[in-house]
Interface confidence: low
């Protein structure tokens, strides 16, 4: 099997219309605190080099990125909604923990690094803008993964 | 219920240094960030910074770097406010809160530190 | 770091009154808190998010406000509140800034 055929998601995972919503309406409620417009993490940058079918590990990458230091270290703001998508988005994180690509990976890795040097950059405002797309990063994982 | 209990009051010399402990229990303790604020007889709040036990991530105010650290014990769900240097002027007393979005929703009893020769 | 000019410093109202408390932000932020704190006590959290109202707090303190000016109000003063009340906020990343506080006595 290749190796990159773990990089999958159910489609389920993203019809589920409470979670789906409360996904977004985190999404919104930190984008009402992002003051840095001209500032987009998630979009055609972050994929550019990248093949469609590496474009799930690619996600991956980015996801995980962002639970681990972005949403727990912001996880006690946005209430009741960060309480309920973040066990959702571990989820899709453990279901793809077995997502890997057997081969040249460096614009991954480079697209990635771009994404996370920028959030870092912006300090905890760059928390903020990669909670604020959310949402983007729900369907960018919808588009890559299913 | 969210507890938050901290030391007892400190006597100490200009100069020397002092350890605030924060006992949290009722949550999560690595979930949400400890902040730490102090108040000088008669005045006003200052923040004087916060930590993420989580991920032990910090942040200060600019006017106490250097002479403050901020340190946390997953394990015991204690947070810790360490002050060096003190002065007499550092003279206040000092709380830990927890927060919740993005206020400061829980607060200790609160830790008198006189400095004084 | 965002500065916080709370008004007036003090004020002395009577038990009905209606008390309103104004808090000024050097530059815009997304949400204000307010606080009270009774002498020998921890401050304590009645309003965040602007217009929330904590749990257990009795529906005469309400907020409002947006961008740089916010308002506190007390819509029938009692006994009870008088206190220093604080405004707060955390949009100037990383700080958190108070206001100088509003001493509150009753008449």
């Known amino acids: 099997l290749p190796v990159n055929t773990r990089c999958k998601l159910e489609v389920s995972n993203f019809q589920q219309p409470y979670i789906v919503n409360r996904t977004f309406m985190l999404a919104k409620e930190a984008s009402l605190a992002d003051n840095n417009t001209d500032v987009r993490l998630i979009g055609e940058k972050l994929f550019r080099g990248v093949s469609a079918k590496d474009q799930c590990y690619l996600m991956k990458q980015v996801l995980n990125f962002t639970l681990e230091d972005v949403l727990l270290p912001q996880s006690d703001r946005f209430q009741p909604y960060m309480q309920e998508v973040v066990p959702f988005l571990t989820k899709l994180s453990n279901q793809l923990s077995s997502c890997h690509i057997s081969g040249d990976d460096q614009n991954i890795q480079k697209n990635v690094r771009r994404l996370k040097e920028t959030v870092k950059k912006l300090g905890e405002s760059g928390e903020i803008k990669a909670i604020g797309e959310l949402d983007l990063l729900f369907m960018s994982l919808r588009n890559a993964c299913v | 219920q969210v507890q938050l209990v901290q030391s007892g009051a400190e006597v100490k010399k200009p100069g020397a240094s002092v350890k605030v402990s924060c006992k949290a229990s009722g949550y999560i303790f690595r979930s949400y960030w400890i902040h730490w604020i102090r108040q000088p007889p008669g005045k006003g709040l200052e923040w004087i910074g916060r930590?993420?036990?989580?991920?032990?991530?910090?942040y200060y105010n600019e006017k106490f770097k250097g002479r403050v650290t901020i340190s946390a014990d997953k394990s015991i769900s204690t947070a810790y406010l360490q002050w060096s240097s003190l002065k007499a002027s550092d003279t206040a007393m000092y709380y830990c809160?927890?927060?919740?979005?993005?206020?400061?929703?829980?607060w200790g009893q609160g830790t008198l530190v006189t400095v004084s020769s | 770091a965002i500065q916080l000019t709370q008004s007036p410093s003090s004020l002395s109202a009577s038990v009905g009154d209606r008390v309103t408390i104004t808090c000024s932000a050097s530059?815009?932020?997304?949400?204000m808190h307010w606080y009270l704190q009774k002498p020998g006590q921890s401050p304590q959290l009645l309003i965040y998010?602007?217009?929330k109202l904590a749990s257990g707090v009795p529906s005469r303190f309400s907020g409002s406000g947006s961008g740089t000016d916010f308002t506190f109000t007390i819509s029938s003063l009692e006994a009870e509140d008088a206190a220093t009340y604080y405004c707060q906020q955390w949009s100037s990343n990383p700080y958190i800034t108070f206001g100088q506080g509003t001493k509150v006595e009753i008449k």
């Open positions: 530059s815009s932020v997304s949400y």
């Open positions: 998010e602007t217009r």
């Open positions: 930590i993420y036990p989580g991920t032990g991530r910090t």
């Open positions: 809160a927890r927060s919740y979005d993005y206020s400061v929703a829980y």
